[in-house]
Interface confidence: medium
């Protein structure tokens, strides 16, 4: 019955290709374990593995958790894609004072230009408002509201904008939930710093320093402090800690100031597809009869790239512990080996880097 999808007619003699009448051409057949990314793949790079939802395939061909934009002061700029993380940015009316990988660790409200100053450059998600002295010909009422945003009477804007931090709740660090009115009120309560007449709201020299932890002069113990659920990576950037919110994950180590949270599969499951600081796919741990216990093959004997097994497959079994319970999972970085002995005749190793799908076809992770 599937005559609308024949493969034979014109690609004989080349087992790595099939004929697709729908597109009237020969198509490359992806090796077992990889999925086509388009209806008619043409080359090995048109076959790829796919990570679990909310994970992306990084440059090292690893499944890595996409950052989350769940904080009140963040919005999603670009979604989580198969080969790139979700990107978060500060919501409208705010700018990023402490950047993080694919996100922002700390957002501040845009400053409001004081009396006698006008907006030179409006604030963006990345930069604060830049003010400049009003031209002599411009009236206090201003020609355009866009170029003259005066604060409420009796207030004097300052250089340091109001931070928005979910971790604090003082008057100077109001939560974002109040909406636009709150943002305007917060901005209007700023006072102007004497040393910054033309760039109101310019961040301090290290906006990532916690205002609650001043740095004593000469002190070497003055480090950047990231927002909650972010950590300071080796490059000195605030990076989002991975989330263990999936049902099959539990937290192994918490999110610390200098290290990510790490997740592992919940008891009774084992990691089949590892991800940075987490596991992209957990599978039930096999419970085997004693006679079926096998030892993993010596990896040196194999000549192919190793990948984790899929949903529905399991590692070579280990005997169930004496208490009869399935063992807890391995660490997130420990993956299983597929019982796959792809021979030298395979066109590509099954973990070759690959190209973007033009069809949006879901494909599966090879590990």
């Amino acid at each position: 019955f599937p005559q609308d999808r024949p493969f034979e007619d014109t690609c004989h003699g080349n087992p790595s290709h099939y004929y697709d009448k729908a597109v009237r051409r020969c198509c490359y057949r992806c090796p077992m374990g990889l999925f086509p990314t388009q209806q008619c793949p043409q080359r090995p790079t048109d076959c790829r593995k796919q990570c679990e939802p909310d994970y992306y395939l990084d440059e090292a061909d690893r499944c890595t958790a996409c950052v989350t934009c769940s904080r009140d002061d963040l919005v999603e700029k670009t979604p989580c894609a198969w080969n790139s993380s979700r990107v978060c940015e500060c919501r409208p009316g705010m700018f990023c004072s402490t950047s993080a990988v694919n996100s922002c660790a700390r957002c501040f409200f845009h400053s409001v230009c004081p009396a006698g100053m006008i907006v030179k450059f409006p604030g963006t998600a990345q930069k604060n408002t830049v003010c400049e002295p009003a031209s002599p010909g411009v009236s206090p009422a201003c020609a355009s509201p866009e170029n003259c945003k005066e604060p409420s009477s009796g207030t004097i804007p300052q250089a340091k904008p109001t931070p928005v931090s979910p971790a604090t709740s003082s008057a100077s660090t109001m939560p974002v939930r109040g909406g636009t009115r709150l943002a305007q009120e917060a901005a209007s309560k700023l006072t102007r710093a004497p040393d910054s007449p033309s760039s109101v709201g310019r961040p301090s020299s290290d906006p990532g320093l916690s205002p609650t932890q001043p740095c004593p002069e000469g002190s070497g113990d003055c480090r950047k402090q990231c927002e909650p659920d972010y950590y300071l990576d080796e490059a000195g950037r605030c990076t989002a800690c991975v989330s263990c919110s999936r049902d099959d994950l539990v937290e192994k180590t918490p999110c610390a100031w200098n290290s990510s949270r790490t997740c592992e599969c919940r008891p009774g499951m084992i990691c089949a597809t590892s991800a940075t600081n987490s596991c992209a796919r957990c599978v039930p741990y096999p419970i085997c009869a004693a006679e079926t216990v096998t030892k993993p093959q010596d990896m040196a004997e194999k000549d192919t790239t190793f990948e984790a097994p899929p949903l529905g497959t399991q590692p070579d079994c280990n005997p169930t512990p004496e208490n009869g319970e399935a063992p807890a999972s391995t660490s997130p970085t420990q993956s299983l080996l597929v019982d796959s002995q792809a021979s030298k005749t395979l066109p590509i190793p099954t973990s070759a880097p690959v190209a973007l799908s033009s069809t949006g076809k879901p494909v599966l992770d090879a590990g």
Epitope: P2, H12, M32, P310, D339, Q341, L364
Partner: antibody
Framework: EVQLLESGGGLVQPGGSLRLSCAAS????????MSWVRQAPGKGLEWVSG????????YYADSVKGRFTISRDNSKNTLYLQMNSLRAEDTAVYYC???????????WGQGTLVTVSS | QSVLTQPPSASGTPGQRVTISCSGS????????VYWYQQLPGTAPKLLIY???QRPSGVPDRFSGSKSGTSASLAISGLRSEDEADYYC?????????FGGGTKLTVL
Amino acid sequence: EVQLLESGGGLVQPGGSLRLSCAASGFTFSSYHMSWVRQAPGKGLEWVSGIGYGHGGTYYADSVKGRFTISRDNSKNTLYLQMNSLRAEDTAVYYCARYDYDYSFDYWGQGTLVTVSS
Amino acid sequence: QSVLTQPPSASGTPGQRVTISCSGSSSNIGSNYVYWYQQLPGTAPKLLIYRNNQRPSGVPDRFSGSKSGTSASLAISGLRSEDEADYYCAVSSPYSYVFGGGTKLTVL
């Protein structure tokens, strides 16, 4: 016309072995990933094992891993399933199926019955 | 028990429209194609729907598939007596294949 014909089923005692064969015709066998799917009496379908075209990788369900071995002989257009350490729960009709390029099963054989009983 | 959940049975009268559901999770249906197979009594399964909603030639357009989030459904309109069969949803994977438990459709 694409045809898949399974053979080798029968009655075997627990712990015993059987080798199933699937003779393929009507298509270029060496160009296709192949698979075995089974169905216990009165039950649903269960994927058992798959093998890549050429001499591609082999994959197994957790329920048979370490006991079953899938293989193919492209010169004979034949797919095999070597089943060792058979258990009562392996009793089923075993179907040979051809993977389409997107991993659907576009053609199936008629199946061969394997009964594991003492 | 299958990780893809189907109702064990469904029924309808000739001419009626019947829908069979298949529920999964983000790690199976949510991130993969869904397939539907029809197994008439005493025969091998037959591919009915591939890639969520595509029909192979020879399959009447009375059969349609859809997918939304972590669930999928097979709709059969203008039900006929010859549609009485077991229907299985499945999710493709390069390494394995996950079938639903199956739904027995009875044409009353």
